[in-house]
């Protein structure tokens, strides 16, 4: 009798659909060739196939096999009219797998899946599961046709870890999942607000974000021009505001504010604010006249143009009188006093058109 | 048309066992995840065992956790639901449901289990 | 688990009236995964709504459906005879599935 062929190999490439049959020769000398068959098994519907190779081979390739379905492959030595008993094994070549998933289009209530549909004519279509992190049973699923490669997710909590899964379908079988693990965005806060601008405090608001327990809100402030000075506060989920303090007067500073939920963060709601200037400090006078004084000051932190000194009789309701001086000088000597009066001066440190408030002193001639 | 039609239910002693079937037709049922939902006389409904399309993943209420089994046979487009060691508290009418999560979206009439001495 | 309490236990009311069922959930479960199914006697439950709000084929609309969080409604704008029946919510969200324990409707 001949002798079968030996050490059958099969292997299966979902993603093209090929089976590689590969066996070691018979040892009867001077054989035809072999003849390898694939056959469904149990009566299963699908191509029997046959293929006849000289036999200096020993591998053949089938296409076309029905992915998902049992397949008997045998390969008989052949000589002349005569066939050898088969060297036989199944294989089930499997239902190909979407390799390329990705998400797109994250936001708090929903995740976009992408992929590229498998071009294999017995795919019917797909599967789509999500399972919240901590549950067992899948909380969503739908299907899709076999062209779809686009699929959005809504209706998902923010902040939550989802395993997503697309599972290609064929008639009667399906892939392994492809799974990947998401979280949905955690949402930001709304409405930046800024009140009660001092020269060196500021109250933040906003309003927080609904259907949510957050863990906290992170605030975090810097002035505009030095960014890399950045302050931060964690205030509690039920807190909606903070009063930022010791700021640099005259200063804009960029604030944003985000939610945390666990360890993620939102998209930071920004917003830019700045600080008022100011007061001049420390007023004083000397060389006092009959009628005339010298004032001094010292000038504020802010950046500034110039003051403005006003300077009027204390029970006086008239019109004060009014001197600008540059930012560069902190004193002006004013004239043309009343002997033996009280006067008020008051001292405005200005910045263009903005203005710090009152440095107010008295002082007689 | 979507019909769903359950079997193998009867009176049974408490301990003993049981198998239910469940035939499906009018989809592609090895496309569906399935279910066993139950409702004792005169109660609400309970869901008591889902198993996913392929039969690969399998999910119990703790109530029935190590005495029940889902299994189906895609084939043959039937759900099964075998139940061992039945106690008294088991007895209800049991329905088996498509479950397309997150909801059951079509049922059966249901089939009557008594486990009584 | 998620446990889902109905009320009011039984509603008695005549046909054209209108009927509020409501469902209460012991944690937040989002409308996404909230359902309600109707069953007659000697019947299999059938499904009314899914995603909280939305009609599910073949109901009519004097069904709606409405809440978010942890309260939900079902309503019947004008019960007609053949709604008399036992009304269940369910929730997905959470393993297990888990149902209210209905709320009977009957006839006055």
């Known amino acids: 009798p001949l002798s079968p062929p030996t050490n059958l190999h099969l292997e299966a490439n979902p993603d093209t659909g090929v089976l590689t049959v590969s066996w070691e020769r018979s040892t009867t000398p001077d054989i035809t060739g072999y003849r390898i068959t694939t056959t469904p098994t149990n009566g299963q519907q699908g191509n029997s196939l046959e293929e006849v190779v000289h036999a200096d081979q020993s591998s053949c390739t089938f296409d076309n096999l029905s992915p998902g379905l049992e397949y008997n492959v045998s390969v008989y030595t052949v000589k002349d009219d005569k066939e050898s008993v088969p060297i036989s094994d199944t294989i089930i070549p499997e239902v190909p797998q979407l390799t390329d998933l990705s998400f797109v289009d994250i936001t708090d209530s929903s995740i976009g899946l992408r992929w590229t549909p498998l071009n294999s004519s017995t795919i019917i279509g797909y599967r789509i599961t999500v399972v919240a992190a901590g549950e067992g049973i899948p909380i969503f699923e739908d299907f899709v046709d076999s062209s779809v490669g686009y699929y959005t997710v809504t209706g998902l909590e923010p902040g939550i870890d989802y395993d997503i899964s697309v599972i290609t379908l064929i008639n009667g079988g399906e892939s392994a999942p492809t799974t990947l693990t998401q979280q949905t965005a955690v949402p930001p806060p709304t409405d930046l607000r800024f009140t009660n601008i001092g020269p060196d405090t500021m109250r933040v608001t906003w309003a927080p974000p609904p259907s949510i327990d957050l863990t906290n809100f992170l605030v975090r402030y810097s002035p505009v021009k030095n960014e890399e000075d950045v302050a931060e506060l964690s205030i509690s989920p039920s807190d909606n505001a903070v009063v930022l303090t010791n700021l640099l007067p005259g200063t804009e500073y960029v604030v944003s504010v985000s939610s945390v939920y666990e360890q993620h963060e939102s998209t930071p709601l920004r917003g830019r604010q700045k600080t008022g200037l100011d007061s001049p400090t420390g007023i004083d006078f000397s060389d006092i006249t009959a009628n005339s004084f010298t004032v001094h000051w010292i000038a504020p932190r802010a950046t500034i143009t110039g003051y403005r000194i006003r300077h009027h009789p204390e029970h006086f309701s008239g019109r004060p009188r009014e001197d600008r001086v540059p930012h560069s000088r902190n004193s002006i000597t004013l004239t043309n006093l009343t002997p033996g009066t009280e006067y008020v001066v008051s001292i405005v440190a200005l910045n263009g058109r903005e203005e710090s408030p009152l440095l107010i002193g008295q002082q007689s001639t | 048309e979507v019909q769903l039609l359950e079997s193998g239910g009867g009176l049974v002693q408490p301990g003993g066992s049981l198998r239910l079937s469940c035939a499906a037709s009018?989809?592609?049922?090895?496309?569906?995840?399935m279910s066993w939902v139950r409702q004792a006389p005169g109660k609400g409904l309970e869901w008591v065992s889902r198993?996913?399309?392929?039969?690969?993943?399998?999910y119990y209420a703790d109530s029935v956790k190590g005495r029940f089994t889902i299994s189906r046979d895609n084939s043959k487009n039937t759900l099964y639901l075998q139940m061992n060691s039945l106690r008294a508290e088991d007895t209800a009418v049991y329905y088996c449901?498509?479950?397309?999560?997150?909801?059951?979206?079509?049922w059966g009439q249901g089939t009557l289990v008594t486990v009584s001495s | 688990e998620i446990v889902l309490t109905q009320s009011p236990g039984t509603l008695s009311l005549s046909p054209g009236e209108r009927a509020t069922l409501s469902c209460r959930a012991s944690?937040?479960?989002?409308?996404?995964?909230l359902a309600w199914y109707q069953q007659k006697p000697g019947q299999a439950p059938r499904l009314l709504i899914y995603?909280?709000?939305n009609l599910a084929t073949g109901i009519p609309d004097r069904f709606s459906g409405s809440g978010s969080g942890t309260d939900f409604t079902l309503t019947i704008s004008r019960l007609e005879p053949e709604d008399f029946a036992v009304y269940y919510c369910?929730?997905?969200?959470?393993?297990?599935?888990?149902f209210g324990q209905g709320t009977k409707v009957e006839i006055k």
């Open positions: 944690q937040s479960v989002s409308s996404s995964y």
């Open positions: 369910q929730q997905g969200r959470h393993t297990p599935p888990t």
């Open positions: 995603k909280a709000s």
């Open positions: 198993i996913s399309p392929s039969g690969s993943s399998t």
């Open positions: 009018g989809f592609t049922f090895s496309s569906y995840a």
């Open positions: 449901a498509r479950h397309t999560a997150p909801l059951f979206d079509y």
